[in-house]
C-alpha cells in the first residue's frame, strides 16, 4: 500500500538568466528511493538520478543542470522557454512510483521572486 505523499515547491518564478532549485520531498513512508526522474513539460527527461549509477543528464541540459540540494536539482541559465511544468518521479521500494508537479515561470522582470514554499499538489 502506498502511504507516502510528495510535497513540491509548487508554483515558482525566477529571473531569466538566473537559476532555480526544483525540489520534491517524499514523506510519510519508509520506502527506499531507488531512482528519481526529472521531466519537463513536454515529458522529455532532464535528468535521472539512480542510487547506484548516479546522475544521467540528458544532452540538451548537460551544461545547465546541477545536482541537488538533496534529491532536487538546480536548473541554471534560465530562458523563457524553460517556463512550464516539471515533474519529479520517485521510484521506491516497495511502494512503487510517486509523482510531483512544479510549475516554473521564467520572468524577464528584474523583480522576479523565487518562492520555494513546499506544498502538496
Amino acid at each position: 500500500m502506498m502511504t507516502g505523499t510528495i510535497e513540491t515547491t509548487g508554483n515558482i518564478s525566477a529571473k531569466k538568466g538566473g537559476s532555480v532549485i526544483l525540489q520534491c520531498h517524499l514523506s510519510s513512508t519508509m520506502a527506499q528511493v531507488t531512482q528519481v526522474n526529472w521531466e519537463q513539460h513536454d515529458h522529455s527527461l532532464l535528468a535521472i538520478r539512480n542510487a547506484e549509477l548516479g546522475w544521467h543528464i540528458y544532452p540538451a541540459f548537460k551544461d545547465r543542470v546541477a545536482p541537488g540540494p538533496g534529491l532536487g536539482l538546480t536548473l541554471q541559465s534560465l530562458t523563457m522557454n524553460d517556463t512550464g511544468e516539471y515533474f519529479c518521479t520517485y521510484h521506491t521500494y516497495p511502494d512503487g512510483t510517486y509523482r510531483g508537479r512544479i510549475f516554473l515561470e521564467v520572468l524577464e522582470s528584474s523583480v522576479a521572486e523565487h518562492s520555494a514554499r513546499f506544498q502538496i499538489p
Partner: antibody, heavy 117, light 107 residues
Framework: QVQLQQSGPELVKPGSSVKMSCKAS????????MHWVKQQPGQGLEWIGC????????NYNEKFKVKATLTSDKSSSTAYMELSSLASEDSAVYYC??????????WGQGTLVTVSA | DIVLTQSPATLSVTPGDSVSLSCRAS??????LHWYQQKSHESPRLLIK???QSISGIPSRFSGSGSGTDFTLSINSVETEDFGMYFC?????????FGSGTKLEIK
C-alpha cells in the same frame, strides 16, 4: 567495490597553497557528486562544497568560497581540492565523500593538512 | 544557514544500555537528515538516512525517528564497538551543515 583514496599528509607554511586529491574507483565517477568536508582536531564536521564531474559544476559553502577550489579530472577519476592562503585555522583533516541519493555513503580516509612555520 | 543542535554533548553509558541522541534543526527540514558515526582516527560512516531509513550493513540496533525540527537516533542495547562520536547532517538546502556531535563514552 567503491573506494576513495586520498593523497597523503601535507605540512605547509602559512600563506602557501596545497592541492589534495581523491581518487575514485568502483563506480562511474563522472555521474556522482563528490563532496569535501573539513574536520579540525577534536572538532565537528564542516561541509566545504561539492563538484559534479560530469559538467564540472560546483557548489560552495559561502564560508569556503575564497579558501577552496574544487576541480575534477574524469579521465583519471580524481577529484581535487586546492586550499589557498593557508593559516593555522586551516590545519585539519579533509575528507572527500561520494553522495548517493543525498547521503554521504562513501568516505575517503582523509588528508591531514598541518599549517606551521 | 540551518543550525543543527545535538544533545547531550557527551553521553556516558554502560554496554547493554539503550540510549537516545537528539538533533534539533533551527528550521523545518522535513526528513532531510542523516546520522553518521565516527570512531577515533576513522572516517565518518553513514548510519541512518532520511531520518529513519536503515542502511545496509548497519546493525539493526540503530534506528532513527523524527521529522521537521526534532530528530532522534536510538541505539538499542549499546555494544562496546558503538562508542565514539555521532553527527547529524541536513541536506535540505545549501549549505549542508552538521551538528556539533554527541560523544558516546563508556561509563
Amino acid at each position: 567495490q567503491v573506494q576513495l583514496q586520498q593523497s597523503g599528509p601535507e605540512l605547509v607554511k602559512p600563506g602557501s597553497s596545497v592541492k589534495m586529491s581523491c581518487k575514485a574507483s568502483g563506480f562511474p565517477f563522472a555521474n556522482h557528486v563528490m563532496h569535501w568536508v573539513k574536520q579540525q582536531p577534536g572538532q565537528g564536521l564542516e561541509w566545504i562544497g561539492c563538484i559534479f564531474p560530469f559538467n564540472e559544476i560546483t557548489n560552495y559553502n559561502e564560508k569556503f568560497k575564497v579558501k577552496a577550489t574544487l576541480t575534477s579530472d574524469k579521465s583519471s577519476s580524481t577529484a581535487y581540492m586546492e586550499l589557498s592562503s593557508l593559516a593555522s585555522e586551516d590545519s585539519a583533516v579533509y575528507y572527500c565523500a561520494r553522495e548517493q541519493l543525498g547521503s554521504f555513503a562513501y568516505w575517503g580516509q582523509g588528508t591531514l593538512v598541518t599549517v606551521s612555520a | 544557514d540551518i543550525v543543527l543542535t545535538q544533545s547531550p554533548a557527551t553521553l556516558s553509558v554502560t554496554p547493554g544500555d539503550s540510549v537516545s541522541l537528539s538533533c534539533r534543526a533551527s528550521q523545518n527540514i522535513r526528513s532531510n537528515l542523516h546520522w553518521y558515526q565516527q570512531k577515533s582516527h576513522e572516517s565518518p560512516r553513514l548510519l541512518i538516512k532520511y531520518a529513519s531509513q536503515s542502511i545496509s550493513g548497519i546493525p539493526s540496533r540503530f534506528s532513527g525517528s523524527g521529522s521537521g525540527t526534532d530528530f532522534t537516533l536510538s541505539i538499542n542495547s549499546v555494544e562496546t564497538e558503538d562508542f565514539g562520536m555521532y553527527f547529524c547532517q541536513h541536506i535540505n538546502n545549501w549549505p549542508f551543515t552538521f551538528g556539533s556531535g554527541t560523544k558516546l563514552e563508556i561509563k
